[in-house]
Protein backbone atom coordinates (compact mmCIF):
# COMPACT_ATOMS: atom_id res chain seq x y z
CA UNK A 1 0.00 0.00 0.00
CA UNK A 2 2.77 2.40 0.97
CA UNK A 3 5.84 3.26 -1.10
CA UNK A 4 9.29 2.17 0.05
CA UNK A 5 9.88 5.73 1.23
CA UNK A 6 8.99 9.15 -0.03
CA UNK A 7 11.22 12.12 -0.69
CA UNK A 8 10.66 15.75 0.12
CA UNK A 9 12.90 18.06 -1.84
CA UNK A 10 14.42 20.94 0.10
CA UNK A 11 17.12 23.42 -0.92
CA UNK A 12 20.91 23.12 -0.63
CA UNK A 13 21.49 19.62 -1.99
CA UNK A 14 19.46 18.24 0.91
CA UNK A 15 16.55 15.85 0.66
CA UNK A 16 14.27 14.47 3.32
CA UNK A 17 13.40 10.80 3.14
CA UNK A 18 10.64 9.40 5.31
CA UNK A 19 10.75 5.72 6.12
CA UNK A 20 8.71 3.34 8.23
CA UNK A 21 10.09 1.34 11.12
CA UNK A 22 11.47 -2.06 10.04
CA UNK A 23 10.89 -1.35 6.36
CA UNK A 24 13.48 -0.81 3.65
CA UNK A 25 14.21 2.61 2.20
CA UNK A 26 16.35 4.24 -0.45
CA UNK A 27 18.55 7.25 0.31
CA UNK A 28 18.80 8.98 -3.07
CA UNK A 29 21.98 10.39 -4.57
CA UNK A 30 22.95 11.03 -8.16
CA UNK A 31 26.03 12.39 -9.88
CA UNK A 32 27.42 13.21 -13.29
CA UNK A 33 28.83 9.98 -14.62
CA UNK A 34 32.61 9.68 -14.88
CA UNK A 35 35.42 7.17 -14.47
CA UNK A 36 36.99 6.03 -11.17
CA UNK A 37 33.78 6.27 -9.13
CA UNK A 38 34.16 6.60 -5.36
CA UNK A 39 31.08 6.55 -3.11
CA UNK A 40 31.21 7.11 0.64
CA UNK A 41 27.98 7.24 2.67
CA UNK A 42 28.34 8.62 6.21
CA UNK A 43 25.94 9.16 9.10
CA UNK A 44 26.06 12.43 11.08
CA UNK A 45 29.44 13.10 9.43
CA UNK A 46 31.03 10.51 11.71
CA UNK A 47 29.95 6.94 11.16
CA UNK A 48 30.83 5.01 8.01
CA UNK A 49 27.72 3.58 6.47
CA UNK A 50 28.98 2.32 3.10
CA UNK A 51 32.11 2.73 0.96
CA UNK A 52 32.59 1.78 -2.66
CA UNK A 53 35.62 2.39 -4.83
CA UNK A 54 37.85 0.71 -7.39
CA UNK A 55 34.84 -1.27 -8.57
CA UNK A 56 33.79 -2.91 -5.30
CA UNK A 57 32.50 -2.36 -1.76
CA UNK A 58 35.01 -1.66 1.00
CA UNK A 59 33.22 -2.29 4.26
CA UNK A 60 36.15 -3.01 6.57
CA UNK A 61 35.56 0.26 8.43
CA UNK A 62 31.76 0.14 8.25
CA UNK A 63 30.07 0.95 11.55
CA UNK A 64 28.69 -2.34 12.95
CA UNK A 65 25.13 -1.00 13.17
CA UNK A 66 24.99 -0.97 9.34
CA UNK A 67 26.40 -4.46 8.80
CA UNK A 68 24.34 -6.43 6.23
CA UNK A 69 21.86 -3.57 5.96
CA UNK A 70 23.24 -1.47 3.10
CA UNK A 71 23.91 -1.89 -0.59
CA UNK A 72 24.23 0.20 -3.72
CA UNK A 73 22.58 -0.21 -7.10
CA UNK A 74 25.74 -1.64 -8.62
CA UNK A 75 24.43 -1.92 -12.18
CA UNK A 76 23.43 1.74 -12.14
CA UNK A 77 26.57 3.31 -10.68
CA UNK A 78 28.03 3.87 -14.15
CA UNK A 79 24.82 5.77 -15.00
CA UNK A 80 25.29 8.20 -12.11
CA UNK A 81 23.23 6.46 -9.42
CA UNK A 82 24.88 6.49 -5.99
CA UNK A 83 21.66 5.84 -4.04
CA UNK A 84 21.87 3.65 -0.95
CA UNK A 85 19.45 0.79 -0.35
CA UNK A 86 18.94 0.62 3.41
CA UNK A 87 17.28 -2.38 5.05
CA UNK A 88 15.06 -2.49 8.14
CA UNK A 89 15.29 1.09 9.35
CA UNK A 90 14.95 1.79 13.05
CA UNK A 91 14.31 5.01 14.93
CA UNK A 92 18.01 5.07 15.83
CA UNK A 93 18.76 5.50 12.12
CA UNK A 94 17.13 8.93 12.03
CA UNK A 95 19.50 11.75 11.17
CA UNK A 96 21.62 13.27 8.43
CA UNK A 97 23.39 11.09 5.88
CA UNK A 98 26.08 12.49 3.61
CA UNK A 99 26.87 10.93 0.28
CA UNK A 100 30.32 11.74 -1.05
CA UNK A 101 30.72 10.87 -4.73
CA UNK A 102 33.99 11.39 -6.50
CA UNK A 103 34.99 10.71 -10.07
CA UNK A 104 38.03 11.64 -12.14
CA UNK A 105 36.01 14.71 -13.21
CA UNK A 106 34.53 16.08 -9.99
CA UNK A 107 33.53 15.49 -6.38
CA UNK A 108 30.06 16.22 -5.03
CA UNK A 109 28.42 15.77 -1.65
CA UNK A 110 24.69 15.30 -1.12
CA UNK A 111 22.89 15.39 2.20
CA UNK A 112 19.85 13.26 2.95
CA UNK A 113 17.81 13.68 6.13
CA UNK A 114 16.19 10.43 7.21
CA UNK A 115 13.08 10.58 9.37
CA UNK A 116 11.49 7.36 10.58
CA UNK A 117 7.85 6.96 11.51
CA UNK A 118 5.89 4.18 13.18
CA UNK A 119 2.17 3.60 12.94
CA UNK A 120 1.01 0.12 13.90
CA UNK A 121 -2.69 -0.11 13.10
CA UNK A 122 -4.71 1.43 15.95
CA UNK A 123 -7.83 -0.17 17.38
CA UNK A 124 -11.10 1.06 18.85
CA UNK A 125 -12.40 -1.06 21.70
CA UNK A 126 -15.70 -0.99 23.56
CA UNK A 127 -15.37 -2.00 27.20
CA UNK A 128 -17.66 -2.30 30.21
CA UNK A 129 -16.11 -1.52 33.56
CA UNK A 130 -18.60 -2.22 36.34
CA UNK A 131 -21.55 -0.04 35.39
CA UNK A 132 -19.57 2.22 33.07
CA UNK A 133 -19.11 1.94 29.33
CA UNK A 134 -15.90 3.08 27.67
CA UNK A 135 -14.65 3.56 24.17
CA UNK A 136 -10.89 3.22 23.95
CA UNK A 137 -8.82 4.30 20.99
CA UNK A 138 -5.36 2.83 21.22
CA UNK A 139 -2.22 2.42 19.18
CA UNK A 140 0.42 -0.04 20.31
CA UNK A 141 3.37 1.60 18.59
CA UNK A 142 3.50 5.07 17.08
CA UNK A 143 6.19 7.69 16.38
CA UNK A 144 6.30 10.62 16.46
CA UNK A 145 3.60 11.38 19.06
CA UNK A 146 0.26 11.36 17.22
CA UNK A 147 -2.64 13.81 17.27
CA UNK A 148 -5.79 12.21 18.75
CA UNK A 149 -9.17 13.86 18.38
CA UNK A 150 -12.62 12.75 19.52
CA UNK A 151 -16.00 13.80 18.13
CA UNK A 152 -19.48 13.19 19.48
CA UNK A 153 -22.22 13.35 16.83
CA UNK A 154 -19.64 15.04 14.54
CA UNK A 155 -18.87 17.75 17.12
CA UNK A 156 -15.32 17.86 18.52
CA UNK A 157 -14.97 16.97 22.20
CA UNK A 158 -12.39 18.87 24.21
CA UNK A 159 -12.11 16.13 26.86
CA UNK A 160 -9.30 13.90 25.67
CA UNK A 161 -7.49 11.71 28.18
CA UNK A 162 -4.31 10.19 26.86
CA UNK A 163 -2.45 7.39 28.62
CA UNK A 164 1.02 7.28 27.13
CA UNK A 165 3.92 4.90 27.64
CA UNK A 166 7.17 5.50 25.82
CA UNK A 167 9.54 2.70 24.89
CA UNK A 168 13.03 3.07 23.41
CA UNK A 169 11.75 3.63 19.93
CA UNK A 170 8.05 4.54 20.00
CA UNK A 171 5.00 5.47 22.03
CA UNK A 172 2.09 3.28 23.07
CA UNK A 173 -1.05 5.35 23.51
CA UNK A 174 -4.54 4.74 24.96
CA UNK A 175 -7.27 7.34 24.81
CA UNK A 176 -10.36 6.26 26.79
CA UNK A 177 -13.74 8.01 26.65
CA UNK A 178 -16.55 7.37 29.10
CA UNK A 179 -19.78 6.96 27.10
CA UNK A 180 -21.99 5.58 29.89
CA UNK A 181 -25.69 6.13 29.13
CA UNK A 182 -25.04 7.84 25.81
CA UNK A 183 -26.83 7.05 22.56
CA UNK A 184 -24.63 9.38 20.52
CA UNK A 185 -22.23 8.31 17.81
CA UNK A 186 -18.53 8.77 18.51
CA UNK A 187 -15.52 9.14 16.31
CA UNK A 188 -11.84 8.99 17.20
CA UNK A 189 -9.08 10.05 14.78
CA UNK A 190 -5.40 9.25 15.22
CA UNK A 191 -3.06 11.08 12.90
CA UNK A 192 0.65 10.50 12.29
CA UNK A 193 1.75 13.77 10.73
CA UNK A 194 5.15 12.46 9.63
CA UNK A 195 3.81 9.47 7.73
CA UNK A 196 0.77 11.51 6.64
CA UNK A 197 -1.40 8.63 7.79
CA UNK A 198 -4.74 8.92 9.52
CA UNK A 199 -6.83 6.24 11.15
CA UNK A 200 -10.46 6.71 12.21
CA UNK A 201 -12.58 4.73 14.63
CA UNK A 202 -16.37 5.21 14.62
CA UNK A 203 -18.89 3.89 17.14
CA UNK A 204 -22.64 3.86 16.65
CA UNK A 205 -25.30 2.63 19.09
CA UNK A 206 -28.46 1.33 17.44
CA UNK A 207 -31.90 1.40 19.06
CA UNK A 208 -32.62 -1.51 21.39
CA UNK A 209 -34.56 -4.44 19.96
CA UNK A 210 -37.18 -6.41 21.91
CA UNK A 211 -37.78 -9.96 20.72
CA UNK A 212 -39.70 -12.94 21.94
CA UNK A 213 -38.10 -16.29 22.65
CA UNK A 214 -37.85 -18.60 19.58
CA UNK A 215 -38.10 -15.65 17.20
CA UNK A 216 -35.19 -14.52 15.04
CA UNK A 217 -33.51 -11.14 14.99
CA UNK A 218 -31.86 -9.21 12.14
CA UNK A 219 -29.05 -6.89 13.16
CA UNK A 220 -27.84 -4.35 10.64
CA UNK A 221 -24.20 -3.55 9.93
CA UNK A 222 -23.39 -1.40 6.95
CA UNK A 223 -20.16 0.57 6.63
CA UNK A 224 -20.22 4.33 6.32
CA UNK A 225 -19.22 5.21 2.76
CA UNK A 226 -16.90 8.00 3.95
CA UNK A 227 -14.44 5.44 5.32
CA UNK A 228 -15.19 2.23 3.53
CA UNK A 229 -13.28 1.24 0.43
CA UNK A 230 -14.14 -2.24 -0.82
CA UNK A 231 -10.76 -2.50 -2.64
CA UNK A 232 -8.94 -2.35 0.67
CA UNK A 233 -8.50 -5.46 2.83
CA UNK A 234 -10.82 -5.46 5.81
CA UNK A 235 -12.27 -7.81 8.42
CA UNK A 236 -15.79 -7.98 9.81
CA UNK A 237 -16.40 -9.54 13.22
CA UNK A 238 -19.72 -10.08 14.96
CA UNK A 239 -19.48 -10.71 18.69
CA UNK A 240 -21.76 -10.87 21.71
CA UNK A 241 -21.02 -9.48 25.14
CA UNK A 242 -21.56 -11.91 27.99
CA UNK A 243 -20.58 -11.05 31.54
CA UNK A 244 -18.32 -8.22 30.47
CA UNK A 245 -16.41 -10.05 27.74
CA UNK A 246 -17.11 -10.48 24.05
CA UNK A 247 -17.32 -13.88 22.40
CA UNK A 248 -16.94 -14.06 18.62
CA UNK A 249 -19.99 -15.32 16.73
CA UNK A 250 -18.58 -15.01 13.21
CA UNK A 251 -16.06 -13.19 11.08
CA UNK A 252 -15.40 -12.44 7.44
CA UNK A 253 -12.07 -11.70 5.73
CA UNK A 254 -12.32 -9.64 2.55
CA UNK A 255 -8.91 -10.80 1.27
CA UNK A 256 -9.98 -14.45 1.05
CA UNK A 257 -13.75 -13.81 1.11
CA UNK A 258 -13.87 -16.44 3.87
CA UNK A 259 -16.67 -16.54 6.42
CA UNK A 260 -16.12 -18.40 9.69
CA UNK A 261 -19.20 -18.97 11.86
CA UNK A 262 -18.90 -20.13 15.46
CA UNK A 263 -22.62 -20.06 16.35
CA UNK A 264 -24.88 -22.46 14.46
CA UNK A 265 -27.91 -20.17 14.77
CA UNK A 266 -26.02 -17.27 13.17
CA UNK A 267 -26.47 -16.62 9.46
CA UNK A 268 -25.03 -14.18 6.97
CA UNK A 269 -26.51 -13.36 3.60
CA UNK A 270 -23.82 -13.95 0.94
CA UNK A 271 -25.55 -11.65 -1.54
CA UNK A 272 -25.67 -8.85 0.99
CA UNK A 273 -21.98 -9.38 1.81
CA UNK A 274 -21.17 -8.90 -1.87
CA UNK A 275 -22.95 -5.55 -1.61
CA UNK A 276 -20.91 -4.66 1.49
CA UNK A 277 -23.83 -5.22 3.82
CA UNK A 278 -22.78 -7.28 6.81
CA UNK A 279 -26.13 -7.50 8.56
CA UNK A 280 -26.73 -10.81 10.32
CA UNK A 281 -29.58 -13.01 11.49
CA UNK A 282 -29.74 -14.93 14.74
CA UNK A 283 -32.38 -17.66 14.72
CA UNK A 284 -34.34 -19.38 17.46
CA UNK A 285 -33.65 -16.83 20.18
CA UNK A 286 -33.50 -17.88 23.79
CA UNK A 287 -33.39 -15.82 26.97
CA UNK A 288 -29.61 -16.07 27.29
CA UNK A 289 -29.24 -14.30 23.90
CA UNK A 290 -30.14 -11.00 25.58
CA UNK A 291 -27.22 -8.62 25.55
CA UNK A 292 -25.06 -6.39 23.39
CA UNK A 293 -24.04 -7.38 19.87
CA UNK A 294 -21.06 -5.71 18.29
CA UNK A 295 -20.24 -5.49 14.61
CA UNK A 296 -16.62 -4.52 13.98
CA UNK A 297 -15.47 -3.60 10.46
CA UNK A 298 -11.72 -2.94 10.50
CA UNK A 299 -8.99 -2.11 8.01
CA UNK A 300 -5.60 -0.38 8.21
CA UNK A 301 -7.37 2.97 8.00
CA UNK A 302 -10.51 2.63 10.08
CA UNK A 303 -12.57 0.68 12.59
CA UNK A 304 -16.36 0.94 12.44
CA UNK A 305 -18.17 -0.36 15.52
CA UNK A 306 -21.95 -0.81 15.59
CA UNK A 307 -23.66 -1.85 18.84
CA UNK A 308 -27.09 -3.44 19.07
CA UNK A 309 -28.84 -4.18 22.35
CA UNK A 310 -31.19 -7.14 22.16
CA UNK A 311 -33.77 -7.98 24.84
CA UNK A 312 -35.23 -11.48 24.55
CA UNK A 313 -38.47 -11.95 26.48
CA UNK A 314 -40.26 -15.16 27.31
CA UNK A 315 -42.96 -16.08 24.82
CA UNK A 316 -46.60 -16.26 26.09
CA UNK A 317 -46.45 -20.07 26.00
CA UNK A 318 -43.34 -20.21 28.14
CA UNK A 319 -44.78 -17.71 30.57
CA UNK A 320 -48.07 -19.67 30.96
CA UNK A 321 -46.17 -22.95 31.46
CA UNK A 322 -44.33 -21.32 34.37
Amino acid sequence: IFPLAFFIYVPMNEQIVIGRLDEDIILPSSFERGSEVVIHWKYQDSYKVHSYYKGSDHLESQDPRYANRTSLFYNEIQNGNASLFFRRVSLLDEGIYTCYVGTAIQVITNKVVLKVGVFLTPVMKYEKRNTNSFLICSVLSVYPRPIITWKMDNTPISENNMEETGSLDSFSINSPLNITGSNSSYECTIENSLLKQTWTGRWTMKDGLHKMQSEHVSLSCQPVNDYFSPNQDFKVTWSRMKSGTFSVLAYYLSSSQNTIINESRFSWNKELINQSDFSMNLMDLNLSDSGEYLCNISSDEYTLLTIHTVHVEPSQETASHN
Epitope: S35, E36, V38, H40, K42, D45, K48, Y53, K54, S61, Y100, G102, T103, A104, V107, T109
Partner: antibody, heavy 120, light 107 residues
Framework: QVQLVESGGGVVQPGRSLRLSCAAS????????MHWVRQVPGKGLEWVAV????????DYADSVKGRFTISRDNSKNTLYLQMNSLRVEDTAVYYC?????????????WGQGTLVTVSS | DIQMTQSPSSLSASVGDRVTITCRAS??????LAWYQQKPGKVPKLLIY???TLQSGVPSRFSGSGSGTDFTLTISSLQPEDVATYYC?????????FGPGTKVDIK
Protein backbone atom coordinates in the same frame (compact mmCIF):
# COMPACT_ATOMS: atom_id res chain seq x y z
CA GLN B 1 44.08 26.40 -10.36
CA VAL B 2 45.32 23.96 -7.72
CA GLN B 3 48.05 25.37 -5.51
CA LEU B 4 49.90 23.55 -2.72
CA VAL B 5 52.49 25.40 -0.65
CA GLU B 6 54.59 23.49 1.89
CA SER B 7 56.28 25.09 4.87
CA GLY B 8 57.97 24.11 8.13
CA GLY B 9 61.11 22.45 6.74
CA GLY B 10 64.55 23.13 8.14
CA VAL B 11 67.52 21.65 9.90
CA VAL B 12 66.82 19.52 12.95
CA GLN B 13 68.83 17.16 15.14
CA PRO B 14 68.15 13.41 15.22
CA GLY B 15 65.48 12.46 17.78
CA ARG B 16 63.81 15.88 17.58
CA SER B 17 60.41 16.79 16.07
CA LEU B 18 59.21 18.97 13.24
CA ARG B 19 55.79 19.83 11.87
CA LEU B 20 55.27 20.44 8.17
CA SER B 21 52.27 22.35 6.86
CA CYS B 22 50.74 22.53 3.42
CA ALA B 23 48.35 25.36 2.51
CA ALA B 24 45.93 24.36 -0.24
CA SER B 25 43.95 26.60 -2.58
CA UNK B 26 42.19 26.52 -5.94
CA UNK B 27 40.04 23.47 -5.11
CA UNK B 28 37.59 22.28 -2.44
CA UNK B 29 40.17 20.95 -0.01
CA UNK B 30 37.66 19.03 2.16
CA UNK B 31 36.62 16.92 -0.85
CA UNK B 32 40.03 15.43 -1.59
CA UNK B 33 42.48 13.01 -0.03
CA MET B 34 46.02 14.29 0.49
CA HIS B 35 49.45 12.63 0.46
CA TRP B 36 52.95 13.37 1.66
CA VAL B 37 55.73 12.09 -0.63
CA ARG B 38 59.42 12.61 0.01
CA GLN B 39 62.55 12.56 -2.13
CA VAL B 40 66.15 12.44 -1.03
CA PRO B 41 67.93 14.93 -3.32
CA GLY B 42 69.18 13.06 -6.39
CA LYS B 43 67.24 9.89 -5.42
CA GLY B 44 63.78 8.41 -6.10
CA LEU B 45 60.30 9.24 -4.80
CA GLU B 46 59.12 7.63 -1.57
CA TRP B 47 55.46 7.67 -0.61
CA VAL B 48 55.10 8.65 3.07
CA ALA B 49 51.45 8.96 4.11
CA VAL B 50 47.88 9.56 2.98
CA UNK B 51 44.81 11.00 4.70
CA UNK B 52 41.28 10.70 3.42
CA UNK B 53 39.14 13.73 2.56
CA UNK B 54 37.34 13.48 5.92
CA UNK B 55 40.38 12.32 7.93
CA UNK B 56 38.56 9.06 8.67
CA UNK B 57 41.40 6.94 7.31
CA UNK B 58 45.17 7.38 7.40
CA ASP B 59 47.94 5.16 6.08
CA TYR B 60 51.71 5.30 6.41
CA ALA B 61 54.82 3.82 4.85
CA ASP B 62 56.46 1.24 7.11
CA SER B 63 59.55 3.45 7.38
CA VAL B 64 57.62 6.20 9.23
CA LYS B 65 54.85 4.26 10.98
CA GLY B 66 54.62 5.16 14.67
CA ARG B 67 56.81 8.27 14.24
CA PHE B 68 54.94 10.44 11.75
CA THR B 69 51.32 11.58 11.96
CA ILE B 70 49.36 13.00 9.05
CA SER B 71 46.44 15.30 9.85
CA ARG B 72 44.34 18.01 8.27
CA ASP B 73 42.21 20.99 9.18
CA ASN B 74 39.52 21.31 6.54
CA SER B 75 38.35 24.63 7.95
CA LYS B 76 41.84 26.05 7.31
CA ASN B 77 42.50 24.18 4.05
CA THR B 78 45.71 22.90 5.57
CA LEU B 79 47.48 19.54 5.63
CA TYR B 80 50.04 18.66 8.31
CA LEU B 81 52.80 16.14 8.88
CA GLN B 82 53.99 15.82 12.46
CA MET B 83 57.42 14.18 12.41
CA ASN B 84 58.73 12.82 15.73
CA SER B 85 61.90 10.88 16.56
CA LEU B 86 63.54 12.10 13.37
CA ARG B 87 66.39 10.10 11.90
CA VAL B 88 69.20 11.05 9.55
CA GLU B 89 67.54 8.94 6.84
CA ASP B 90 64.42 11.18 7.03
CA THR B 91 66.43 13.93 5.31
CA ALA B 92 64.52 14.73 2.09
CA VAL B 93 62.40 17.19 0.20
CA TYR B 94 58.82 16.64 1.43
CA TYR B 95 56.07 17.15 -1.13
CA CYS B 96 52.44 17.74 -0.28
CA UNK B 97 50.26 16.19 -2.99
CA UNK B 98 46.57 16.05 -3.87
CA UNK B 99 44.82 12.74 -4.47
CA UNK B 100 42.61 12.34 -7.53
CA UNK B 101 39.59 11.77 -5.28
CA UNK B 102 39.13 10.80 -1.65
CA UNK B 103 42.53 9.41 -0.70
CA UNK B 104 42.66 6.06 -2.45
CA UNK B 105 44.11 7.00 -5.81
CA UNK B 106 47.16 8.52 -7.40
CA UNK B 107 48.54 12.03 -7.06
CA UNK B 108 47.38 14.52 -9.68
CA UNK B 109 48.91 17.73 -8.26
CA TRP B 110 52.15 18.36 -6.34
CA GLY B 111 53.48 21.18 -4.21
CA GLN B 112 57.00 22.57 -4.73
CA GLY B 113 58.33 20.77 -1.65
CA THR B 114 60.07 21.78 1.57
CA LEU B 115 63.51 20.50 2.55
CA VAL B 116 63.98 18.72 5.87
CA THR B 117 67.58 18.09 6.94
CA VAL B 118 68.20 15.83 9.93
CA SER B 119 71.76 16.23 11.06
CA SER B 120 73.72 16.32 14.28
CA ASP C 1 53.82 -5.22 1.13
CA ILE C 2 53.97 -5.21 -2.66
CA GLN C 3 57.33 -4.21 -4.12
CA MET C 4 57.69 -2.24 -7.36
CA THR C 5 60.71 -2.66 -9.67
CA GLN C 6 61.58 -0.77 -12.84
CA SER C 7 63.91 -1.54 -15.71
CA PRO C 8 66.16 -0.31 -17.00
CA SER C 9 67.35 1.99 -14.23
CA SER C 10 68.61 4.36 -16.93
CA LEU C 11 68.75 4.55 -20.73
CA SER C 12 70.11 6.74 -23.49
CA ALA C 13 68.33 7.00 -26.81
CA SER C 14 68.32 9.22 -29.86
CA VAL C 15 65.67 11.79 -30.69
CA GLY C 16 62.89 10.02 -32.59
CA ASP C 17 63.62 6.62 -31.02
CA ARG C 18 60.91 4.44 -29.52
CA VAL C 19 61.59 4.05 -25.81
CA THR C 20 60.05 1.41 -23.54
CA ILE C 21 60.25 1.32 -19.74
CA THR C 22 58.88 -1.60 -17.74
CA CYS C 23 57.47 -1.71 -14.25
CA ARG C 24 56.80 -4.91 -12.35
CA ALA C 25 54.71 -5.45 -9.19
CA SER C 26 55.56 -8.34 -6.86
CA UNK C 27 51.82 -9.18 -6.71
CA UNK C 28 48.87 -8.40 -8.97
CA UNK C 29 47.57 -4.85 -8.76
CA UNK C 30 44.96 -5.02 -11.56
CA UNK C 31 45.35 -1.79 -13.55
CA UNK C 32 45.93 0.47 -10.54
CA LEU C 33 49.18 1.91 -11.82
CA ALA C 34 50.24 5.50 -12.53
CA TRP C 35 53.29 6.87 -14.34
CA TYR C 36 55.00 10.17 -13.44
CA GLN C 37 57.64 12.24 -15.19
CA GLN C 38 60.09 14.31 -13.17
CA LYS C 39 62.34 16.68 -15.08
CA PRO C 40 65.58 17.81 -13.44
CA GLY C 41 64.91 20.37 -10.72
CA LYS C 42 61.11 20.12 -11.15
CA VAL C 43 58.28 18.46 -9.28
CA PRO C 44 56.80 15.22 -10.61
CA LYS C 45 53.99 15.38 -13.20
CA LEU C 46 51.27 12.79 -13.78
CA LEU C 47 51.46 11.21 -17.26
CA ILE C 48 49.29 8.09 -17.17
CA TYR C 49 46.81 6.54 -14.74
CA UNK C 50 44.82 3.30 -14.73
CA UNK C 51 47.86 1.77 -16.48
CA UNK C 52 46.90 3.13 -19.89
CA THR C 53 44.84 6.33 -19.62
CA LEU C 54 46.65 9.46 -20.73
CA GLN C 55 46.29 12.44 -18.39
CA SER C 56 44.84 15.44 -20.22
CA GLY C 57 47.50 17.72 -21.69
CA VAL C 58 50.07 14.93 -22.01
CA PRO C 59 51.42 14.43 -25.57
CA SER C 60 50.05 11.39 -27.40
CA ARG C 61 53.55 9.97 -27.97
CA PHE C 62 53.29 8.68 -24.39
CA SER C 63 51.30 5.49 -23.87
CA GLY C 64 50.93 2.87 -21.18
CA SER C 65 49.89 -0.76 -21.15
CA GLY C 66 49.72 -3.82 -18.92
CA SER C 67 47.65 -5.28 -16.13
CA GLY C 68 48.26 -7.49 -13.12
CA THR C 69 52.00 -7.46 -12.49
CA ASP C 70 53.67 -6.26 -15.73
CA PHE C 71 53.35 -2.76 -17.11
CA THR C 72 55.11 -0.66 -19.76
CA LEU C 73 55.46 3.02 -20.52
CA THR C 74 56.26 3.75 -24.15
CA ILE C 75 57.49 6.98 -25.74
CA SER C 76 56.84 6.41 -29.45
CA SER C 77 59.24 9.13 -30.64
CA LEU C 78 61.64 10.50 -28.07
CA GLN C 79 61.88 14.31 -27.92
CA PRO C 80 64.55 16.45 -26.20
CA GLU C 81 61.96 17.70 -23.67
CA ASP C 82 61.36 14.09 -22.57
CA VAL C 83 64.69 13.99 -20.73
CA ALA C 84 63.54 13.11 -17.19
CA THR C 85 63.23 10.36 -14.63
CA TYR C 86 60.06 8.24 -14.95
CA TYR C 87 58.41 6.61 -11.95
CA CYS C 88 55.59 4.08 -11.72
CA UNK C 89 53.34 3.99 -8.65
CA UNK C 90 50.84 1.38 -7.53
CA UNK C 91 47.58 2.60 -6.00
CA UNK C 92 45.47 -0.53 -5.59
CA UNK C 93 45.85 -0.15 -1.81
CA UNK C 94 48.13 1.55 0.69
CA UNK C 95 51.08 1.75 0.88
CA UNK C 96 51.13 3.53 -2.48
CA UNK C 97 54.68 2.52 -3.34
CA PHE C 98 56.71 4.09 -6.15
CA GLY C 99 59.11 2.23 -8.37
CA PRO C 100 62.82 3.24 -8.10
CA GLY C 101 62.66 5.27 -11.32
CA THR C 102 64.14 5.11 -14.83
CA LYS C 103 66.38 7.95 -15.96
CA VAL C 104 66.03 8.79 -19.67
CA ASP C 105 68.48 10.99 -21.54
CA ILE C 106 69.43 11.74 -25.10
CA LYS C 107 72.50 10.24 -26.80
Amino acid sequence: QVQLVESGGGVVQPGRSLRLSCAASGFTFSNYGMHWVRQVPGKGLEWVAVIWYDASEKDYADSVKGRFTISRDNSKNTLYLQMNSLRVEDTAVYYCAKDLISGIYYVDHWGQGTLVTVSS
Amino acid sequence: DIQMTQSPSSLSASVGDRVTITCRASQGISNYLAWYQQKPGKVPKLLIYAASTLQSGVPSRFSGSGSGTDFTLTISSLQPEDVATYYCQKYNAAPFTFGPGTKVDIK
